[in-house]
C-alpha cells in the first residue's frame, strides 16, 4: 500500500506494487511530486537553467561553482546543464593555501595581501593587490562559509507540453 | 510506431459547433498527456489546450475558454474536442499531439484535420 | 504571454550550407525551447528539444543551443529534405507559444 513505498517510488494501481518513480536524464531536475506512494499525473523532468547542472536521477538543478567571483579561480572549464564548472589555478592576485584540508567547496584562493613572505604566488604581484575581483562589492572577500551554497529555487514551470 | 489520426472537420456556420476526435495507436494512450494544436490558413502555430493522461488536469488557451472542452475516452484510445460557438477565426487545421512520455513538449504530431467557419 | 520572434522568416540557402535559425523569446524561459519542422504536406515533426536535445532518430546536422532568452537551430551541410517551415516553440510557461516560423527553400 501507499505507505509502504520509499522515498521515490509511487503506488502502482494495476501491479498493487510500489514502483520508482521515473529517473530524470543529465541536464535535467523532477517537476511536480513523485515519491512516498504518489505521483502527479503530469509528473516530468525540465531542463537546467543557465549557471545550474544535474546529473540526473532524482536530483535538483544546482548552480556551477563560481570560480571567480567566489574561489578567485580562473574557469578551467564552464559548467553547461549537465556539469559543473571546473576551477583551473588562482587568479592573479590571489594564492592557494598549502597543506590545508579540503572543505566542502574545495581549494579556495584567498588574497596575496593575506599572504606570507615568499608565497610563490604572489612573489611580483602588484603591491596593494584588490582582495575584490572586478564585479563584486567593495567588501573583502568572502570566507568559504559564508557563501550561501544551495541554491533551492523553483523553475517557474507550469506543467504540460 | 507511435500514429495519431484527426477526424472531424469540415465546413460549419458561425456560432455552430463540432466535435474533432483524434484516434492514437502504437503506445499506452492511457499513459500520456495529449494536446490540440491548431494552424491557421498561412499562419503560425497555436496551442490550445492540454488533458493529462487519467484527465485530471486540463488547460485551454485564453482564446478558446469556454467554447472549447479537451476530453478524452482512454478505454477507445481517443482524444476529443468538442468545440462551440465557432467563429471565422477558429478557422484552422487542427492537430492532435502528443506529450513525451517525462517530458514538457509535443513529442508526436496526427496529420492534422480542416475546420472551416464560414457562412 | 510570453512572444517568440523568429527570424529569418524566410531563407533561401544551397545544398551542403550551415543554415542558422533564430528564436528570441519575450522573457528567459530557463532552456525550455523546442524546434519543430513542418513539411509543404502539413507534417510536422519534433527536431531539438529542451534547447540543445536532438529528438531520437533524427540526423546530427541539427543541432540546438542558446539560453535565457537568445536561442538557434543550426543545420549543417543542408539536405534536400530539409525544405520546409521551422518553428520555434517555449515549454516554460502557459499559454505554450510558438515561433512565426522560417520558411527554408533551396537556392
Known amino acids: 500500500e501507499y505507505s509502504n513505498c520509499g522515498e521515490n517510488e509511487y503506488y502502482n494501481q494495476t501491479t498493487g506494487l510500489c514502483q520508482e518513480c521515473p529517473p530524470c536524464g543529465p541536464g535535467e531536475e523532477p517537476y511536480l511530486s513523485c515519491g512516498y506512494g504518489t505521483k502527479d499525473e503530469d509528473y516530468g523532468c525540465v531542463p537546467c537553467p543557465a549557471e545550474k547542472f544535474s546529473k540526473g536521477g532524482y536530483q535538483i538543478c544546482r548552480r556551477h561553482k563560481d570560480c571567480e567571483g567566489f574561489f578567485r579561480a580562473t574557469v578551467l572549464t564552464p559548467g553547461d546543464m549537465e556539469n559543473d564548472a571546473e576551477c583551473g589555478p588562482c587568479l592573479p592576485g590571489y594564492y592557494m593555501l598549502e597543506n590545508r584540508p579540503r572543505n566542502i567547496y574545495g581549494m579556495v584562493c584567498y588574497s596575496c595581501l593575506l599572504a606570507p613572505p615568499n608565497t610563490k604566488e604572489c612573489v611580483g604581484a602588484t603591491s596593494g593587490a584588490s582582495a575584490n575581483f572586478p564585479g563584486t562589492s567593495g567588501s573583502s572577500t568572502l570566507s568559504p562559509f559564508q557563501h550561501a551554497h544551495k541554491e533551492l529555487s523553483g523553475q517557474g514551470h507550469l506543467a504540460t507540453a | 510506431e507511435v500514429k495519431l489520426e484527426e477526424s472531424g472537420g469540415g465546413l460549419v456556420k458561425p456560432g455552430g459547433s463540432r466535435k474533432l476526435s483524434c484516434a492514437a495507436s502504437g503506445f499506452t494512450f492511457s499513459d500520456y498527456g495529449m494536446h490540440w494544436v491548431r494552424q491557421a490558413p498561412e499562419k503560425g502555430l497555436e496551442w490550445v489546450a492540454y488533458?493529462?493522461?487519467?484527465?485530471?488536469?486540463?488547460y485551454y488557451a485564453d482564446t478558446v475558454k469556454g467554447r472549447f472542452t479537451i476530453s478524452r475516452d482512454n478505454a477507445k484510445n481517443t482524444l476529443f474536442l468538442q468545440m462551440t460557438s465557432l467563429r471565422s477565426e477558429d478557422t484552422a487545421m487542427y492537430y492532435c499531439?502528443?506529450?513525451?512520455?517525462?517530458?514538457?513538449?509535443?513529442?508526436?504530431w496526427g496529420q492534422g484535420t480542416t475546420l472551416t467557419v464560414s457562412s | 504571454d510570453i512572444v517568440m520572434t523568429q527570424s529569418p522568416s524566410s531563407l533561401s540557402a544551397s545544398l551542403g550550407d550551415r543554415v542558422t535559425i533564430s528564436c528570441r523569446a519575450s522573457?528567459?524561459?530557463?532552456?525550455?525551447l523546442n524546434w519543430y519542422q513542418q513539411k509543404p504536406d502539413g507534417t510536422v515533426k519534433l527536431l531539438i528539444y529542451y534547447t540543445s536535445r536532438l529528438h531520437s532518430g533524427l540526423p546530427s546536422r541539427f543541432s540546438g543551443s542558446g539560453s535565457g532568452t537568445d536561442y538557434s537551430l543550426t543545420i549543417s551541410n543542408l539536405e534536400q529534405e530539409d525544405i520546409a517551415t521551422y518553428f520555434c516553440?517555449?515549454?516554460?510557461?502557459?499559454?505554450?507559444?510558438f515561433g512565426g516560423g522560417t520558411k527554408l527553400e533551396i537556392k
Open positions: 516553440q517555449q515549454g516554460n510557461t502557459l499559454p505554450y507559444t
Open positions: 499531439a502528443r506529450r513525451e512520455l517525462l517530458r514538457y513538449y509535443f513529442e508526436y
Open positions: 488533458i493529462s493522461s487519467g484527465s485530471s488536469t486540463i
Open positions: 522573457q528567459d524561459i530557463s532552456n525550455h
